[in-house]
Each structure stands twice: as structure tokens, then as C-alpha cells.
Amino acid sequence: PGPPAGSPRVSSDPRADLDSAVLLTRSLLADTRQLAAQMRDKFPADGDHNLDSLPTLAMSAGTLGSLQLPGVLTRLRVDLMSYFRHVQWLRRAAGPSLKTLEPELGALQARLERLLRRLQLLMSRLALPQAAPDQPAVPLGPPASAWGSIRAAHAILGGLHLTLDWAVRGLLLLKTRL
């Protein structure tokens, strides 16, 4: 009769799990792109914004060829956990301006959490170690000003967009090697 409803299915093909992760990543990428556009429309960005607490981009065109599944999944999960914390911080600390984007930020956080759970599941199915971040998470301090919060939001959404973009490419490439 099959497993009870709601229980995780046992997959014999990790490629199916990878497909599912790619789908979720693509969906989150679209959400992020849309929210970043909304941000730019509502609070125009004056140039590029950086945030020291954000992870550095793990992948580039040069490194795509040498990617290995364990490394990609581990790094992606660690980076997305950092972005999850940053989005959470934005929602709670960034001031009234960003509350106007609260439904979208809330949905983004929920989908990020869903992707993180999917990556964790994929790693356990592939018997990969659930690596902890290299260093403990730095507590995110209060924003210096509302203007600073908006700049931080631009940086977070921009960085997440780039990370997800490379994640989709990397995961699709790795799928062909499985």
C-alpha cells in the first residue's frame, strides 16, 4: 500500500532528488529576482552594496568545471543558511520601511527554509556529512540607520540572487555527472 502520507519517500535515484532541489532553487531564484526588482523600484539603489557579514560567492565560471557534489551541496547549504539568517534579521530589525515588503520577505524566508530542508535531505540520502559552518555565525548587529538597512537589503537580495543563479547552474551540471 506504500508509505503513509506525509512520510518521506525512499528514493533509489538521487537524480530525482537533485531535480527537486533544482526546481526549488529555480523557484526561489525567481522570487528573489522579483523582490530585488521591487526593492529597486521602491528604494532605488545608488550603486552596488556590500555587507561584510554575507558569504563570499562560492562559484564562478572558472570553477564550474571542477565542481564536486559533496563540496557544492555543503557550501550551498552553509551559504543559504547565512542568507536565511540575514533575511530573518531584515524582517525583524530593518525598520518600518521594509515592513511594506513584509509578505514577500516572509514568503522568501519560508521558501529558503524549504530549500535548506531539501538540501539536508539530499545530503543524508547521498550519505554526505552534514558539515557545520567553518566559523560560528556572527551575530548581526542593529542597523546604523534606516538608510543603512535599505542598503543592506539591496546587498542581501543581490547576493542571494547571485548565489542561487550559480547554484542552479552547478546543480544542473552535477546532475549530468551522477
Epitope: P96, K99, P142, S145, A146, G148, S149
Partner: antibody, heavy 117, light 111 residues
Framework: QVQLVESGGGVVQPGRSLRLSCAAS????????MHWVRQAPGKGLEWVAV????????FYADSVKGRFTISRDNSKNTLYLQMNSLRAEDTAVYYC??????????WGQGTLVTVSS | QSVLTQPPSASGTPGQRVTISCSGS????????VNWYQQLPGTAPKLLIY???LRPSGVPDRFSGSKSGTSASLAISGLRSEDEADYYC???????????FGGGTKLTVLG
């Protein structure tokens, strides 16, 4: 140092209007969201309104919605509160306050508004 | 009737530790940071604790904040006569789209 100075308070009849101002100095005014908070005589603090750093986002307490308008002029480093259709229950000391996020790190000394016939 | 609930009064003797509670809901304290303000008689309020448990520079470490679920508390240790004031908690409320305050707690330092 950061300074916020409110002005424009006074005695006004019910149904009339009044405009409060808050002159800011000692910081980059255009980088901060600004709030108005009031305190009726012998009572607690009540939040009134907030305006975002560049003026596009505004939120109001239900008790003043449709009657009060918050605005700012970043070129003059000044915050305003236009109060229309004033009622006796609007009698209070009105404070302007600066906020980096959701906490008020600097407050003005307050200006008293008395609504009485 | 305030959205956040505080006891109207609290008291203690010099040197004692006093705690003031602040109770809210999932839409304010449960999902946003809590701040505490001190208002000395006849003066404007002053920020005492922000971001649940952070102290602005100049605020003595006798003052500390904590939060659990939908409740927060302010603790004052080594009570001094100059601590006699009104204390207010506040947070953003996502349902009301605004800042909410507690009704305030009048702290009396006895003796």
C-alpha cells in the same frame, strides 16, 4: 551631538488644526526614519506615526488615521505633524524621535498640545 | 488599554534586584525586537535596552533585558534611588503596522 527640537504646540479648540515641527541637527537626517510619540498628562506613551528616511513610507496609529499627516523636508532637516480635526483626547506632550530600526535612540524635549474649548 | 501588558508598579530597596515584565503576543514581541525606555519625572523618555538585550553606551550594566516567546523582562540589579522612574517596553506590531507600548511601570525605590 544629536538634537531634536519640537515646536508648534499650544492651546487649540476642538475641530481646529495645528502643525508641529521638529528641527533635527547633529546627524544625517535623511538617513533615519522618524516618529511622533505622544503622552497625555499623567498617562503612558502612545505611538502616533512614522515616516521613512526618504518620505515614501508612512504608518499611523488607528487613533489618528485620516486626521494626522506626517511629513518631512530633508533639505531643511525638519519633521512635521499636521493635525486636523483635533479632539480633547489629542491633548498631550508630542515628542519626535529618531530611529535606526524600531527603537527610538534620541527624543526631543516635547511640545504640549492642549485641545480645549 | 495597552497592547503590551506591564505591571503598573514595582518597588525595591537600594541594592536589591527588581524585575519588570512585559507581555505581548506573536504579532509584536513574538516576532519583533523589544525595547525598554526609562522616563524620569518631567523629562523625555530615554532608551535603556534595545534589540531585546542590548544596552546603548552610557547605560550601566545594572540594567539588562531578556525575552522568551511573547514575553520580555527588564532586570535592574543594585537598585539606586536615581532609578526611580517610569519604565516602558515597546515593540513593532505586525498586525497593527505600528509601534506598541506597554502601559508603563512606576518603579519606587524604598527607604
Amino acid at each position: 551631538q544629536v538634537q531634536l527640537v519640537e515646536s508648534g504646540g499650544g492651546v487649540v479648540q476642538p475641530g481646529r488644526s495645528l502643525r508641529l515641527s521638529c528641527a533635527a541637527s547633529g546627524f544625517t537626517f535623511s538617513h533615519y526614519d522618524m516618529h511622533w510619540v505622544r503622552q497625555a498628562p499623567g498617562k503612558g506613551l502612545e505611538w502616533v506615526a512614522v515616516i521613512s528616511y526618504e518620505g515614501s513610507v508612512k504608518f499611523y496609529a488607528d487613533s489618528v488615521k485620516g486626521r494626522f499627516t506626517i511629513s518631512r523636508d530633508n533639505s531643511k532637516n525638519t519633521l512635521y505633524l499636521q493635525m486636523n480635526s483635533l479632539r480633547a483626547e489629542d491633548t498631550a506632550v508630542y515628542y519626535c524621535a529618531r530611529t535606526p530600526g524600531f527603537h527610538f535612540d534620541y527624543w526631543g524635549q516635547g511640545t504640549l498640545v492642549t485641545v480645549s474649548s | 488599554q495597552s497592547v503590551l501588558t506591564q505591571p503598573p508598579s514595582a518597588s525595591g530597596t537600594p541594592g536589591q534586584r527588581v524585575t519588570i515584565s512585559c507581555s505581548g503576543s506573536s504579532s509584536n514581541i513574538g516576532s519583533n525586537y523589544v525595547n525598554w525606555y526609562q522616563q524620569l519625572p518631567g523629562t523625555a523618555p530615554k532608551l535603556l535596552i534595545y534589540y531585546d538585550d542590548l544596552r546603548p553606551s552610557g547605560v550601566p550594566d545594572r540594567f539588562s533585558g531578556s525575552k522568551s516567546g511573547t514575553s520580555a523582562s527588564l532586570a535592574i540589579s543594585g537598585l539606586r534611588s536615581e532609578d526611580e522612574a517610569d519604565y516602558y517596553c515597546s515593540a513593532w506590531d505586525d498586525s497593527l503596522s505600528g509601534v506598541v507600548f506597554g502601559g508603563g511601570t512606576k518603579l519606587t525605590v524604598l527607604g
